[in-house]
Amino acid sequence: AMDLILINSLPLVSDAETSLTCIASGWHPHEPITIGRDFEALMNQHQDPLEVTQDVTREWAKKVVWKREKASKINGAYFCEGRVRGQAIRIRTMKMRQQASFLPATLTMTVDRGDNVNISFKKVLIKEEDAVIYKNGSFIHSVPRHEVPDILEVHLPHAQPQDAGVYSARYIGGNLFTSAFTRLIVRRCEAQKWGPDCSRPCTTCKNNGVCHEDTGECICPPGFMGRTCEKACEPHTFGRTCKERCSGPEGCKSYVFCLPDPYGCSCATGWRGLQCNEACPSGYYGPDCKLRCHCTNEEICDRFQGCLCSQGWQGLQCEKEGRPRMTPQIEDLPDHIEVNSGKFNPICKASGWPLPTSEEMTLVKPDGTVLQPNDFNYTDRFSVAIFTVNRVLPPDSGVWVCSVNTVAGMVEKPFNISVKVLPEPLHAPNVIDTGHNFAIINISSEPYFGDGPIKSKKLFYKPVNQAWKYIEVTNEIFTLNYLEPRTDYELCVQLARPGEGGEGHPGPVRRFTTASIGLPPPRGLSLLPKSQTALNLTWQPIFTNSEDEFYVEVERRSLQTTSDQQNIKVPGNLTSVLLSNLVPREQYTVRARVNTKAQGEWSEELRAWTLSDILPPQPENIKISNITDSTAMVSWTIVDGYSISSIIIRYKVQGKNEDQHIDVKIKNATVTQYQLKGLEPETTYHVDIFAENNIGSSNPAFSHELRTLPHSPASADLGGGK
């Protein structure tokens, strides 16, 4: 699946510049291409390493240029090699002296197994010496000096694969540098056959294309493309998709093209001769001008493309009528696709006429693996091939190539695939707290292995030996409810990134055990201040059915100072605890539970203030309202936290002695209003309100005045008091 081409310009070396260019056309191979000396074909050649450079005029090509060096440095056999999926594709070629005594008829010769073959060398220099012929450096044949013909031939009546190799010819007094070389390529199979046992019939390769004995595919000559090599490229272009161009002023003149075996080497279409510098004579076209035009309707014979058919006609001789063929085109393929590792179903869509079939559409992975469609359908104008890659992995990232090869031509479109690693948490989730039926879990997605961004998180949980359940979570802290008590649970987190199949493998598993169902909280809990620095918590005696030892855990917290918290363990046979070393005039919250090995259920919270260490402040917002001839409503508010135990309302008639006052003591500090009754009509009273706590009474700043209304006969005198 690699389009490797070696251009030998020129194979006959004189004192002019000569070069080798190796092109990996269309897409970048995984490993770099190399050019080297082919010592297998020719042992005794120069040992100096070649100076291989990048061919800047092409996207992916290497080049060796000899600038009029001594020809001995150049004479020899060469190869260009590219690797796909660890398999080497090697193209061979040769360079020899233009001043050699003999010259080969062709640089390479491809024959089928069993063919009757004549390998020919043309005598260029006449010498009174024997002529000798060697194969791969070993002597095979000599011709006495008086019998050396103008065309020196090696005759192989039944060519076999072992006959393949480099044949050289020279006079006996000559040497490597006066030798002429030609390479015989013998296809493993008889004519028009391919396959491991050569039983499969070849596609008929047109325009001198050669059927590959291992794949059955046509190797098309430079200037032709498509499944059968029927489609001619634009003049001066070559390559499997005709994307490469000869940059010379006369196109591909003086370029000898060498392709993978069994093709060998030839001129581009339109040229012939050992140096490919002779244009085809009239009526001939194709590589080495070996094809003859037989245009049906007297159409023009183009030396590059053959018969140029008029509208409505097609075929090599323009012998077929019908809809003109259209080179396939690849449609709607993005340049870059990001996919998640796992199953991947790339789609390749192509137009053209005839529409590509399933067998004509392939997908080439960066490592050279060729995929065939798994599913295929036609629409009105397109062929759609769906490929299946069961497990695409990050090493599969790189340039993939959608390739379509029909009788109407070939097209390849590379596109970049970036395979992302699915995210997986590196750590198990942390269990912050558990109860008998819940767990509080920290589900941090960081750190994770793989590629982000993280789109979603699933928390998987299960009791050991049961099936997994999951819940989608968004926050980092999550409470898992409705768990079974005293049960081993397993937890893990699955992360997902954007795109289809973005869910990663769940991360490491955390095990935890829910608590047993605890005992109920103590009953009859009461929290009362004991002193300025102590509170007393009491409860009813605790009886349990369990034989386990138990204790009461009391937790107290200051509501003012959040850091002030204390947990006290109280033996289970006690019914109270003194919470001491507290701060005066501070509110505390207290709760209790009964613990065995398992923790019990917490009680509701109780709140209480420690006794005050100062006099209470005066009641505030004192208002006197709803005044009648004998009653009035007094209301007030008190400030929390001063251990106020009672409110005293003191009132007296204006002008009366101080000791003639009446005190009303309200012992429920939560009462905030009181109705004075039994007042005299049309009388002015002075009213004071005090707050009383463990230290004493508050100091009123001033008295409030109240004047009752005139007597009203309707009002019934219910007397004083409450």
Partner: antibody, heavy 122, light 112 residues
Framework: EVQLVESGGGLVQPGGSLRLSCAAS????????MHWVRQAPGKGLEWVAG????????VYADSVKGRFTISRDNSKNTLYLQMNSLRAEDTAVYYC???????????????WGQGTLVTVSS | DIQMTQSPSSLSASVGDRVTITCRSS???????????LDWYQQKPGKAPKLLIY???NRASGVPSRFSGSGSGTDFTLTISSVQPEDFATYYC?????????FGQGTKVEIK
């Protein structure tokens, strides 16, 4: 004109060293293997050493092995023979010769230099 | 090493005579193909040797046709069909089958 010109001969004491050179012209020097052949006064020819066109193959006569070194510089079209630990029996005219081959096989020496005399004596 | 033995060590001939020199090797010089790895050289006094025949029977460029080489295996012959004044010299055979390359001791052809 095709020619080989030796230089560097002379009188040297036993155990001494000498370096012979052979300058080539008129042909493509690095197309061919090269050799040194010597001839003791009034005696026959004796092959001394040979070197292939690219110095890939070098061979010596047993009588000089370990003492003489043949080398070539293709960029200068020159062949060399470094002679160490010279003995009286090394006294001879030393010829450089061009092979018709590029390797040391099927040798034939079609071009010879005029020779340079090496005398080893105390 | 391969030993090369020439005979005679010297001979006298008149101009126009047919001269034959033989050379025997201690082992066969016939290679796997039909060529024998043996060369013949001519040396005149005070001059460098000159190649006459290579690979047993192939005349070197510029060598007159009166010189010919023959023989195979271990026995070889250099023949001068009609000796000329310029042919009086010493002739050496040399084997090239294996290194070290070895010469015969020489055959001196003198004017009678």
């Amino acid at each position: 004109e095709v020619q080989l010109v030796e230089s560097g001969g002379g009188l040297v004491q036993p155990g001494g060293s000498l370096r012979l050179s052979c300058a080539a012209s008129g042909f493509t020097f690095d197309d061919y293997a090269m050799h040194w052949v010597r001839q003791a006064p009034g005696k026959g020819l004796e092959w001394v050493a040979g070197i292939s066109w690219n110095s890939g193959s070098i061979v010596y006569a047993d009588s000089v092995k370990g003492r003489f070194t043949i080398s070539r510089d293709n960029s200068k079209n020159t062949l060399y023979l470094q002679m160490n630990s010279l003995r009286a029996e090394d006294t001879a005219v030393y010829y450089c010769a061009k092979d018709i081959r590029e390797q040391l096989v099927e040798d034939a020496f079609d071009i010879w230099g005029q020779g340079t005399l090496v005398t080893v004596s105390s | 090493d391969i030993q090369m033995t020439q005979s005679p060590s010297s001979l006298s001939a008149s101009v126009g005579d047919r001269v034959t020199i033989t050379c025997r090797s201690s082992q066969s010089l016939l290679h796997s193909h039909r060529y024998n790895y043996l060369d013949w050289y001519q040396q005149k006094p005070g001059k460098a040797p000159k190649l006459l025949i290579y690979l047993g029977s192939n005349r070197a460029s510029g060598v007159p046709s009166r010189f010919s080489g023959s023989g195979s295996g271990t026995d070889f012959t250099l023949t001068i069909s009609s000796v000329q004044p310029e042919d009086f010299a010493t002739y050496y055979c040399m084997q090239t089958l294996q290194t070290p390359l070895t010469f015969g001791q020489g055959t001196k052809v003198e004017i009678k």
